[in-house]
């Protein structure tokens, strides 16, 4: 890894678990300044592997709302607009970090948690098992 | 929103910015216990809108390594294995939370940051504006 010289202006931590427990400012800085606001908004319908978005809410988590993609079909949409089972719609999944309140119901104490979310779907060639 | 009764065992915070600055335990709890480790690993090659994964490293960020998808083609792969321009490969993007060291180079002080990442690609019908 890369060794970074410590900034002398860093806050001190008296926590016995240091450096495992850290201070986090929740005023979110949004880096997505130069993006097209339309982005992926209509891809779920225009895709050959379309998906629906389901709201997953958990007040003990930050962010409390996460949208999960569920592929609409087993196959993919062909040029005629029909579902073609020569291909498969599959979810593209990503591991993301969220903050989990710990102990539960505490407003100012969290633990990092890794969760797997389905972001959208893509159309893939199926894995074909050949039989003699 | 949902009102949650405060747990009396919560740690106190003397921070003047409370509740915007919170304590976070970095011992990550992984909820992805029952997932297939292979997951989306080969979709990037099997997809009709294949993508390459590019490593984005930033030691001032947690996690420091994020993988970004870049669609390989302008069009999508058809049944003959050729790029077909009737369709377009587009990235599926997701906003994720990361921790940014603040002040810089501090090991125990972070700020939440929202970044947009491309997770994979999907094949979409183009926006057609003109009729013969």
């Amino acid at each position: 890894g890369i060794t970074i010289p410590r900034n002398p202006g860093c806050p001190n931590s008296e926590d016995k678990n240091f450096p495992r427990t850290v201070m986090v400012n929740l005023n979110i800085h949004n880096r997505n300044t130069n993006t097209n606001p339309k982005r992926s908004s209509d891809y779920y319908n225009r895709s050959t592997s379309p998906w629906n978005l389901h709201r997953n809410e958990d007040p003990e988590r930050y962010p409390s709302v996460i949208w999960e993609a569920k592929c609409r079909h087993l196959g993919c949409i062909n040029a005629d607009g029909n579902v073609d089972y020569h291909m498969n719609s599959v979810p593209i999944q990503q591991e993301i970090l969220v903050l989990r309140r710990e102990p539960p119901h505490c407003p100012n104490s969290f633990r990092l948690e890794k969760i797997l979310v389905s972001v959208g779907c893509t159309c893939v060639t199926p894995i074909v098992h050949h039989v003699a | 929103g949902i009102t949650i009764p405060r747990n009396p065992g919560c740690p106190n915070s003397e921070d003047k910015n409370f509740p915007r600055t919170v304590m976070v335990n970095l011992n990550i709890h992984n909820r992805n216990t029952n997932t297939n480790p292979k997951r989306s690993s080969d979709y990037y090659n099997r997809s009709t809108s294949p993508w390459n994964l590019h490593r984005n490293e930033d030691p001032e960020r947690y996690p420091s390594v994020i993988w970004e998808a870049k669609c390989r083609h302008l069009g999508c792969i058809n049944a003959d294995g050729n790029v077909d321009y009737h369709m377009n490969s587009v990235p599926i993007q997701q906003e994720i939370l990361v921790l940014r060291r603040e002040p810089p180079h501090c090991p125990n002080s972070f700020r939440l940051e929202k970044i947009l990442v491309s997770v994979g690609c999907t094949c979409v019908t183009p926006i057609v504006h003109h009729v013969a």
């Epitope: 097209n36 339309k38 | 870049k70 669609c71 390989r72 083609h73 302008l74 050729n82 790029v83 321009y85 009737h86 377009n88 490969s89 587009v90 990235p91 690609c121 183009p126 926006i127 057609v128 504006h129 003109h130 009729v131 013969a132």
Partner: antibody
């Protein structure tokens, strides 16, 4: 009204670099593929590169691969062509062109160069 | 790469003449062909796409036909503003390729 305005051309020594810009207006920039097509003095048209701003996906002619880089800034509605390691044979008029998807009876819909810069 | 060969390279014609330009692809390109008109010092202009569909604002005297490897651009009655160079272009596969051009001159 659709407009494509190129800039950035000039005289450069072999091995030098140049960056061309194509400012687009009058249409939804991310919905179209944008290309660069060149024409050497007294010669025909040669496709150079294409980008789809919505995806960032790109394609290049073999003659420029590894030397030229096409990019797009969707906030500025501008496509760019960064040309490095320039050679005498790169001397040409470079046109920026939009590829619009058109319906036709024969092949449903497909992209064609419908507007060109001047 | 798919080679596009136009013939003739140049032709002389008079106003009112019927003019035919042909374009041959080195392999089948179905109907993935366009025709462009270019006047000196100007950018090309789309005339025909999908081998036979006329682009918006293009006069009806311009027509396109063909599929597979052989294509034709026809100007039914040549007008003074039609004197220019015409290019065919295939969009069947990358790289996109153009014909070498046909120059239509005044006789």
């Amino acid at each position: 009204e659709v407009q494509l305005v190129e800039s950035g051309g000039g005289l450069v020594q072999p091995g030098g670099s140049l960056r061309l810009s194509c400012a687009a207006s009058g249409f939804s920039f991310t919905s179209y593929m944008m290309s660069w097509v060149r024409q050497a003095p007294g010669k025909g048209l040669e496709w150079v590169s294409t980008i789809y701003p919505e995806s960032g996906a790109t394609d290049y002619a073999d003659s420029v691969k590894g030397r030229f880089t096409i990019s797009a800034d969707t906030s500025k509605n501008t496509a760019y062509l960064q040309m490095n390691s320039l050679r005498a044979e790169d001397t040409a008029v470079y046109y920026c062109a939009r590829e619009g998807y058109y319906y036709s009876t024969s092949i449903k819909y497909y992209p064609w160069f419908d507007y060109w810069g001047q | 790469d798919i080679q596009m060969t136009q013939s003739p390279s140049s032709l002389s014609a008079s106003v009112g003449d019927r003019v035919t330009i042909t374009c041959r692809a080195s392999q089948s390109i179905s109907s993935y062909l366009a025709w462009y008109q270019q006047k000196p010092g100007k950018a090309p202009k789309l005339l025909i796409y999908g081998a036979s569909s006329r682009a918006s604002g293009v006069p009806s005297r311009f027509s396109g036909s063909g599929s597979g490897t052989d294509f034709t651009l026809t100007i039914s009655s040549l007008q003074p503003e039609d004197f220019a160079t015409y290019y065919c272009q295939q969009r069947y596969s990358q790289p996109i390729t153009f014909g070498q051009g046909t120059k239509v001159e005044i006789k």
